[in-house]
Interface confidence: low
């Protein structure tokens, strides 16, 4: 027979030879980190047809690490569903909790004993410090000193001392996020007042008022014989300026050689009209990062060598 088979869990006792006589027997022993459980055989014999009798290393079992319980408010997930050495234990906290300690423990062989690479982590409740105070405004739950995950506060502006009110710029409600940080910056309270928009040779068709505060919206149309240069809709922005700028009504000059076109009350040229959405200074959509289970990047929760969950 040729050299006997090799196995993952057991090794040949003695050195292999290039040739074996029929009837010759070889014995195996469990490798370091594996232990023998009877009754399966760990030897084989060179058969008369020059092949080794069937043998397997099923009798040699991997050393296993001690059982780990789920952390309070979390889970201990054995990668590949096993506690055997060479594998890992992954720790995941429930929503609203974060991990203190190692996210992955490794089942390692120390001598012939399998032990975990460290102490199991714990899952702590996500807490936020009070949100920022703002000038000329206040938020709900101002007396609370510690906020829990997803706790929300809502800001409002104080009554203004003068004739013009404070406007709330930004989102009024913020919440305690999963990484102990408030979901967005606090809003601000300030007086926002835009000048009365005057359009010569045109008129206001909506948004009438004597005073124009934050987010006030006004629409215009030009008189007959005039066309709109700019946007027909403007909004009072947080800098007390109109966005887009107040439009102009310009006179329609009839072409010299052709008959002038029939005019409606307002003629808008698409090349000069800017919609509020496309305005360069218009409001930007805010990006809220996706909720994850751990600040920044975790170590690979799924784990190295983790083919099966």
């Amino acid at each position: 027979c040729e050299e006997p088979p090799t196995f993952e869990a057991m090794e040949l006792i003695g050195k292999p030879k290039p040739y074996y006589e029929i009837g010759e027997r070889v014995d195996y022993k469990c490798k370091k980190g594996y232990f023998y459980i009877p009754p399966l055989a760990t030897h084989t014999i060179c058969d008369r047809n020059h092949t080794w009798l069937p043998v397997s290393d099923d009798a040699c079992y991997r050393e296993t690490c001690p059982y780990i319980r789920d952390p309070l408010n979390g889970q201990a997930v054995p990668a590949n569903g096993t506690y055997e050495f060479g594998y890992q234990m992954h720790f995941i906290c429930n929503e609203g909790y974060y991990l203190i300690g190692e996210e992955i423990l490794y089942c390692e062989l120390k001598g012939s004993v399998a032990i975990w690479s460290g102490k199991p982590p714990i899952c702590e409740k996500v807490l936020c410090t009070p949100p920022p105070k703002i000038k000329n405004g206040k938020h709900t739950f101002s007396e609370v000193e510690v906020f829990e995950y997803l706790d929300a506060v809502t800001y409002s502006c104080d009554p203004a001392p003068g004739p013009d009110p404070f406007s709330l710029i930004g989102e009024s409600t913020i919440y305690c996020g999963d990484n102990s940080v408030w979901s967005r910056a606090a809003p601000e309270c300030k007086v926002v007042k835009c000048r009365f928009p005057v359009v010569e040779n045109g008129k206001q068709i909506s948004g009438f008022g004597k005073k124009f505060y934050y987010k006030a919206t006004v629409m215009f149309e030009c008189d007959k014989g005039f066309y709109l240069d700019g946007s027909d809709t403007i909004v009072c922005d947080s800098n007390s300026t109109w966005d887009p700028p107040v439009p102009k009504c310009l006179k329609v000059l009839p072409p010299s050689s052709t008959k002038p076109p029939a005019l409606s009350h307002s003629v808008s040229t698409s090349s000069t009209t800017k919609s509020p959405a496309s305005s360069a200074s218009g409001p930007r959509p805010t990006y809220k990062p996706p909720v994850s289970n751990y600040p920044g990047y975790p170590k690979p929760e799924e784990g190295i060598l983790d083919s099966l969950d």
């Epitope: 490794y106 975790p298 170590k299 099966l308 969950d309």
Partner: antibody, heavy 116, light 107 residues
Amino acid sequence: QVQLQQSGGGVVQPGRSLRLSCAASGFTFSSYAMHWVRQAPGKGLEWVAFIRSDGSKKYYADSVKGRFTISRDNSKNTLYLQMNSLRAEDTAVYYCARHGNYFDSWGQGTLVTVSS
Amino acid sequence: DIQMTQSPSFLSASVGDRVTITCRASQGISSYLAWYQQKPGKAPKLLIYAASTLQSGVPSSFSGSGSGTEFTLTISSLQPEDFATYYCQQLASYPLTFGGGTKVDIK
């Protein structure tokens, strides 16, 4: 044998969206975590995204976070990459890869070109 | 993020040569390292995982060694089909990162 068949690449304008698919066969798809990796023309490999076998955990590279979404349908043995707000720098060959003994099986790759 | 630095980035060799490529991690990654081979227009192919374990079906002329921050891929006798680009990759923590690659071409 293990096979990962990719589709969905093409030419797209900046700011637009595209969805890549990776159809798996020859193994129990629902037991394996999966990844997307990309390679810009003439450049090295860059890991893009990861999804756990049951879809419960996903991780992304900083360069795609908030724009790309990895997902899977275990009943259809298919992995997806939804790419929104595409940029010129997203131009690359995209590969899906199985997380077995590390990245032991790869798709054939699909080219995504972002150009106006 | 863990940076993976591969050297050299370019290597000229002849058939039968012994070739060594090194990969250095910016922080310890134990043995969580893989080596891949990529040929033009093809997907990468896994050669070595867990720093030194040969993937099934890969010729024994390929071997890997190292642990912690220093790793080596060795081709004991370069064959014509081995001319390709080689990448190392760490799987110790997210984001997963690859080395910049080593192109092995014919001298």
